[in-house]
């Protein structure tokens, strides 16, 4: 009710002889500040005196008198809130009731606190979770209902008397609600901790033992098993017997079922602690274990690897890689199931035993066509030799070999012939599928690998073929050696270097560009007349009569070829000049007379000069001299001179007679 003082503190405090006690305490007085405080031990109310009797442990009065006991007991409070007390050291006879007598100006109050002091340090208390399972982390708690500032203590964890490695977390509480020291240890128990003793040990600041609490761990775990095998190395031969025994070294709770597994799969009808395998076969090789279950779950033993040894099985050959390209590398692998693994191998190529090849692998760094064929092997171990399997085929692929171009025609080949060539090869893998020819031409391929050249040209010198599968192999070019008549025959003037003048020495050469065969004959002709049979035609002193159209012919065993006609031109000064008169050399006066200066010249006359009988040059310079009308006095002898680039020529005199007309005669 409202007439009560309000106090807060632990109901009971615990300590032991020689330790100390710290009493956390708060209060609220009914009115005003605290004026007087007395700490009683086991106070009793005296009705007669209306006062409390008992041992006074501490007294605080207005006059300030404090008994000697006050050195052990301390009031750490104040006049309005705090009533905390400390007793140091605390003694066994301090056990009982502590009475806090509080007086203010108008009110009084007696507050009671229980103190339990034991003769020796009391043990802490270990708290465990309700169930502990292997490998699951748990927290172990050690609780001691004691804490005092003046008396440091420590709690240590031990497993089977040995300090535990795990770090513990210690906490203390000194509050009006509770006073304790607590240590918490996080711990993952293993099955092997089952039944082990855990201790929480109370020690003083120097590590001196004060007290302890112990518990026995009850760690739930799956069955722990040991497997034993006879023979102990678990290596047997086909037909032998094997016994495996499963022993339970620990189980909590008790086991319920047993089974056996091979390579992780349960063996049917094997539910006892002994597994008997009679007359084992190689298929029974594998990893065996036993499995025993309890309420926690199944436990498995370690695996026993049972090796049933047997001679190698028939071998197979693996080729990396087939088909193989010539020049590449290839590896053969001999595969044979055997136990123990084969120690020796025998290799065969096309059924013949290969020497010096006794490894599991055969490596060929650079494959050649001769490596092709069937490869087989035999494996051998301590128990015997296997059988040779079917083998594997190595296919070596390569370009066509020894390719040749062959001329099918009878020799020699003449220009214009039809030539047939074939492309031959020695071997090829894969097969030849096509052929190529060089140079390219509009030629026929009547069948695969055959080339037909119709009307072969004189200049078809060489032909090469290639036989192709995945690759093309070229043959060396073959010379057709086509024979033909001389070609490009022409006449060439060797001398003189400039134009030919009459009287010059002249040489003509009969040239040709090529001839096969090379042996040739020459023929010169002019106007169908044979002039010579040498390559040159020579004139010591050329005359205008030698001018004309010349041809030369060149002959070989294939045929003859003529040059184009070549015109020989001879340059000479005007010659054979004469004056011709028209209408005649007798003309009647008054008529017209034409004198023409005729000549033979090369080049033609470019300039004419006329002269009279007095060798007087006339003012006329053309080829014709026209007199119109002609007069009697024109009668007389005339001559002309012709000029060209070579020189001059003159005609003999020609006489013109002009007679009188009848009219003139009549007038006379």
């Amino acid at each position: 009710d409202s007439s009560k003082w309000v106090f807060e503190h632990p109901e009971t405090l615990y300590a032991w002889e020689g330790a100390c006690v710290w009493i956390p305490c708060t209060y609220r007085a009914l009115d005003g500040d605290l004026e007087s405080f007395i700490l009683f031990h086991n106070p009793e109310y005296n009705k007669n005196t209306s006062k409390f009797d008992g041992t006074r442990l501490y007294e605080s009065t207005k006059d300030g008198k404090v008994p000697s006991e006050q050195k052990r007991v301390q009031f750490l409070g104040d006049k309005n809130k705090n009533c905390t007390l400390s007793i140091h050291p605390v003694h066994l006879n301090d056990s009982g009731q502590l009475g806090l007598r509080m007086e203010s100006k108008t009110e009084k109050w007696m507050e009671r606190i229980h103190l339990n002091v034991s003769e020796r340090p009391f043990p802490p208390h270990i708290q465990l979770p309700p169930e502990i399972q292997e490998s699951q982390e748990v927290t172990l708690t050690c609780l001691l209902n004691f804490s005092c500032y003046g008396y440091p203590i420590q709690l240590q964890w031990l497993l089977e008397g040995v300090p535990m490695r795990q770090a513990a977390v210690t906490s203390t509480s000194l509050t009006i609600k509770s006073v304790f020291t607590r240590s918490e240890l996080k711990f993952s128990p293993q099955w092997s901790h089952h039944g082990k003793i855990v201790t929480c040990q109370l020690q003083d600041a120097d590590g001196k033992f004060l007290s302890n609490d112990t518990v026995q761990l009850n760690v739930k775990h799956t069955p722990k098993l040991e497997i034993k095998v006879t023979p102990s190395d678990a290596i047997v031969r086909e037909g032998d017997s094997v016994t495996m025994t499963c022993e339970v070294s620990s189980s909590n709770p008790e086991y319920t079922t047993v089974s056996w597994l091979k390579d992780g799969t349960s063996l049917k009808k094997q539910n006892t602690f002994t597994l008997n395998l009679r007359e084992v076969t190689k298929d029974q090789s594998g990893k065996y274990c036993c499995q025993v279950s309890n309420d926690v779950g199944p436990g498995r033993s370690e695996e026993v690897f049972l090796q049933v040894q047997y001679a190698p099985e028939p071998s197979t050959v693996q080729i990396l890689h087939s088909p193989a390209v010539e020049g590449s590398q290839v590896e053969f692998l001999c595969m044979s199931l055997a136990n123990p693994l084969p120690t020796n191998y025998t290799w065969y190529h096309n059924g013949k035993e290969m020497q010096g090849r006794t490894e599991e692998k055969v490596h060929i760094p650079k494959i050649l066509p001769w490596h092709a064929g069937t490869y087989s092997c035999v494996a051998e171990n301590i128990l015997g030799t296997g059988q040779r399997g079917p083998g594997a085929e190595l296919d070596v692929q390569y370009p066509p070999k020894k390719v040749t171009t062959v001329i099918q025609n009878p020799m020699p080949i003449r220009e214009g012939d039809t030539v047939t060539l074939s492309c031959n090869y020695n071997s090829s893998n894969p097969s030849v599928t096509r052929y190529e020819w060089k140079p390219h031409g509009a030629w026929e391929e009547p069948s695969l690998g055959v080339l037909k050249i119709q009307n072969v040209g004189w200049d078809n010198t060489t032909i090469a073929c290639a036989a192709c599968n995945s690759w093309c192999s070229w043959a060396s070019p073959v010379a057709l050696n086509v024979q033909y008549a001389p070609r490009d025959v022409r006449v060439r003037k060797i001398k003189p270097l400039s134009e030919i003048h009459s009287g010059n020495s002249v040489s003509l050469q009969c040239d040709f560009s090529s001839s096969h065969p090379k042996e040739v004959q020459f023929f010169w002709e002019k106007n169908g007349r044979l002039l010579g049979k040498e390559s040159q035609l020579n004139f010591d002193s050329i005359s205008p009569e030698d001018a004309g159209s010349y041809s030369c012919w060149v002959n070989n065993s294939i045929g003859q070829t003529a040059s184009k006609a070549w015109t020989l031109e001879v340059l000479y000064a005007p010659r054979r000049l004469r004056v011709s008169m028209s209408p005649g050399d007798q003309v009647m006066e008054g008529k017209s007379a034409t004198l023409t200066c005729e000549s033979d010249a090369n080049p033609p006359v470019s300039h004419y000069t006329w002269f009279d009988w007095n060798n007087q040059s006339l003012p006329y310079h053309s080829q014709k001299l026209r007199l119109e009308p002609v007069k009697v006095q024109h009668s007389g002898a005339y001559w002309c001179q012709g000029t060209n680039s070579v020189g001059k020529g003159r005609s003999p005199l020609s006489t013109l007679t002009v007679y009188y007309s009848p009219e003139t005669i009549g007038r006379r």
Epitope: K352, R357, P365, K366, W370
Partner: nanobody, 122 residues
Framework: QVQLVESGGGLVQAGGSLRLSCAAS????????IGWFRQAPGKEREGVSC????????YYADSVKGRFTISRDNAKNTVYLQMNSLRPEDTAVYHC???????????????WGQGTQVTVSS
């Protein structure tokens, strides 16, 4: 094109020695078998000796072991067969052969030479 040319054959008395040579050309691999086989008139071909070019390992027919030695001169591309303690039964045409492997019956006879006559008189 592989070409093998043998030389060094001849007539020798029993207990004598001969050295056969085989000049090889045209082999495009560094790893091949080369060796000797022999053929006597009316008899089966018999492998005599073989060696691998890659590692120089050598093999001999039981009938010539300890008497014949195969060797090579890489620089000259030549293989030799040194024949000691010759016997009349060694009389045969000796062929040099090259191939992929040494076989128990001799070299893999992919390519072989014309042979050289060895006659051992008693």
């Amino acid at each position: 094109q592989v070409q093998l040319v043998e030389s060094g054959g001849g007539l020798v008395q029993a207990g004598g020695s001969l050295r056969l040579s085989c000049a090889a050309s045209g082999i495009t691999s560094d790893d091949y078998a080369i060796g000797w086989f022999r053929q006597a008139p009316g008899k089966e071909r018999e492998g005599v000796s073989c060696m691998y070019s890659s590692d120089g390992s050598t093999y001999y027919a039981d009938s010539v072991k300890g008497r014949f030695t195969i060797s090579r001169d890489n620089a000259k591309n030549t293989v030799y067969l040194q024949m000691n303690s010759l016997r009349p039964e060694d009389t045969a045409v000796y062929h040099c052969a090259a191939g992929p492997w040494c076989f128990v019956t001799g070299v893999g006879r992919e390519e072989w030479g014309q042979g050289t006559q060895v006659t051992v008189s008693s």
